[in-house]
């Protein structure tokens, strides 16, 4: 999996009026890193993880881009012409990501309430658009503001690409991300649904990277997907994910149902436990 | 114009706590960091620490954390600074100072000379 | 903490001069160093961001250079209102720390 870093910025504007506030969010080989509210802009790392690496650095620089970037954004969204009444938004993703060959990319995205409008491959300059004509409009405009000057806008963009790796090597460098392998905690829980029927719940914590197979089986045969239901896989703000699996069994066939982790290679199984029932809450309606 | 406003002088006596004040008037006073420094007479600049009005989040300089409370009133745009125990060590010119980008102090008080005597 | 050692003490100069400060981290510390003058009795005032960003209504005649460690504020024709203590500070690590100055005086 590639290294990546990933800025997530959205400013909005009301009746037409470009608000003064912006949201910057970055994340880092997945999780999240920096935050620039809007009050007061302060890059803070999110969470335990990312503020031991570093220890008692200001983020000064890291604050100083995110606020130029937020003007920016304020600035593009101040260009785009027949903006309805009501609350309205201006995000820009920008990713780039350093692979295990040591190639990268980078790339850029445009969304207008929500809804992409405006592509760039920040390596090759090409840009595309959805076909919608509400989209083309859009990208039209933006991208004939972002090309006023065109010198400033070549700059602009090679300038952004460097950056974002450049910054990308700086975290890899200090140690922020190291390629590491922390292996999930396993916990089978079970609780009533109806009558005759329990739910059982397979919670996967604290494990990195962030892909797992998390799955139900009956007598080591893993049950259809339209039988279980998953949860996303989350940060939980310590540098680690957490995920989980849920099916709805019938009471007294426990001993048959085992939860299937898989992750970086290694796996186990993890049966239901007997006994009387923990909690008195379904998954599902 | 921004203005920071702060008394000119306070005699303190060893051991009784004094509230330093600095008046904020012509910007958005909840919209900045406010940063304390201290100047020893003859002697450079430290810094003490910085508050946000918006929230009264604080950041302090590990070495005043027993020494100094940082607090804001928003309705009267007031920063203030209390010095907790003051010795003659605490004998100095206190300077508060609004932030204007990540770290840099564009407006100062002209400073509270504050005298520890008995 | 970063210590910023500030160099000379004292610098000596007549009106019209060239005059370069010098202010030297104990780590590197990136572009996040500003510089203050304070005159005598009076409080500090912005010069120069993050090594040689310029501050609007100040003169042209104050620049700053450098990065990582090294870092130099010039006042490329010196006047006598140009006397008074001059502050490097950096911004890069907690706590933010201030060198400890160096005093600009006339021949």
């Known amino acids: 999996e590639p290294h990546s870093l990933r800025y997530n910025l959205t400013v909005l504007s009301w009746d037409g009026s470009v608000q003064s506030g912006f949201l910057t969010e970055v994340h880092l080989d997945g999780q999240p890193f920096l935050r620039c509210d809007r009050q007061k802009c302060r890059a803070k790392p999110q969470g335990q993880w990312a503020e031991d690496v570093l220890g008692n650095k200001t983020w000064d620089r890291e604050t100083r881009d995110l606020t130029g970037n937020g003007k920016d954004l304020r600035m593009t969204l101040a260009h785009i012409k027949d903006q309805k009444e009501g609350l309205h938004s201006l995000q820009e993703i920008r990713v780039c990501e350093i692979h295990e060959d040591n190639s990268t990319r980078s790339s850029q995205h445009f969304y207008y309430d929500g809804e992409l409008f405006l592509s760039q491959n920040l390596e090759t300059k090409e840009w595309t658009m959805p076909q919608s004509s509400r989209a083309q409009t859009l990208a039209m405009n933006v991208r004939n503001f972002l090309k006023e000057d065109a010198m400033k806008t070549k700059t602009h963009y090679h300038a952004m690409h460097a950056d974002c790796l450049q910054e990308l090597r700086r975290y890899l460098k200090s140690g922020v991300v190291l390629r590491r392998t922390v292996p999930p905690m396993v916990n089978v829980t079970r609780s009533e649904a109806s009558e005759g029927n329990i739910t059982v719940t397979c919670r996967a914590s604290g494990f990195y990277p962030w892909n797992i197979t998390l799955s139900w089986r009956q007598d080591g045969v893993s049950l259809s997907h339209d039988t279980q239901q998953w949860g996303d896989v989350l940060p939980d703000g310590n540098g680690t994910y957490q995920t989980w699996v849920a099916t709805r069994i019938c009471q007294g066939e426990e001993q048959r149902f085992t939860c299937y982790m898989e992750h970086s290679g290694n796996h186990s199984t993890h049966p239901v436990p007997s006994g009387k029932v923990l909690v008195l809450q379904s998954h599902w309606q | 114009q921004v203005q920071l406003q702060q008394p000119g002088a306070e005699l303190v006596r060893p051991g009784a706590s004094v509230k330093l004040s600095c008046k904020a008037s012509g910007y958005s006073f909840t919209s900045y960091w406010m940063n304390w420094m201290k100047q020893r007479p003859g002697q450079g600049l430290e810094w003490i620490g910085m508050?946000?009005?918006?929230?009264?989040?604080?950041r302090l300089n590990q070495k005043f954390k027993d020494k100094a409370t940082l607090t804001v009133d928003k309705s009267s745009s007031t920063a203030y600074m209390q010095l907790n125990s003051p010795t003659s060590e605490d004998s100095a010119v206190y300077y508060c100072?609004?932030?204007?980008?990540?770290?840099?102090?564009?407006?100062w008080g002209q400073g509270t000379s504050v005298t520890v005597s008995s | 903490d970063i210590l910023l050692t500030q160099s000379p003490a004292i610098l000596s100069v007549s009106p019209g001069a060239r005059v370069s400060f010098s202010c030297r981290a104990s780590q590197n510390i990136d572009t996040s160093i500003h510089w203050y003058q304070q005159r005598t009795n009076g409080s500090p005032r912005l010069l120069i961001k993050?090594?040689?960003e310029s501050i609007s209504g100040i003169p042209s005649r104050f620049s700053g250079s450098g990065s990582g460690t090294d870092f130099t504020l010039s006042i490329n024709s010196v006047e006598s209102e140009d006397i008074a203590d001059y502050y490097c500070?950096?911004?890069?690590?907690?706590?933010?720390?201030f060198g400890a100055g160096t005093k600009l005086e006339l021949k």
């Open positions: 508050i946000h009005p918006s929230d009264s989040e604080t």
């Open positions: 100072a609004r932030e204007m980008g990540p770290y840099t102090l564009d407006y």
């Open positions: 993050y090594a040689s």
């Open positions: 500070q950096q911004s890069n690590y907690w706590p933010l720390t």
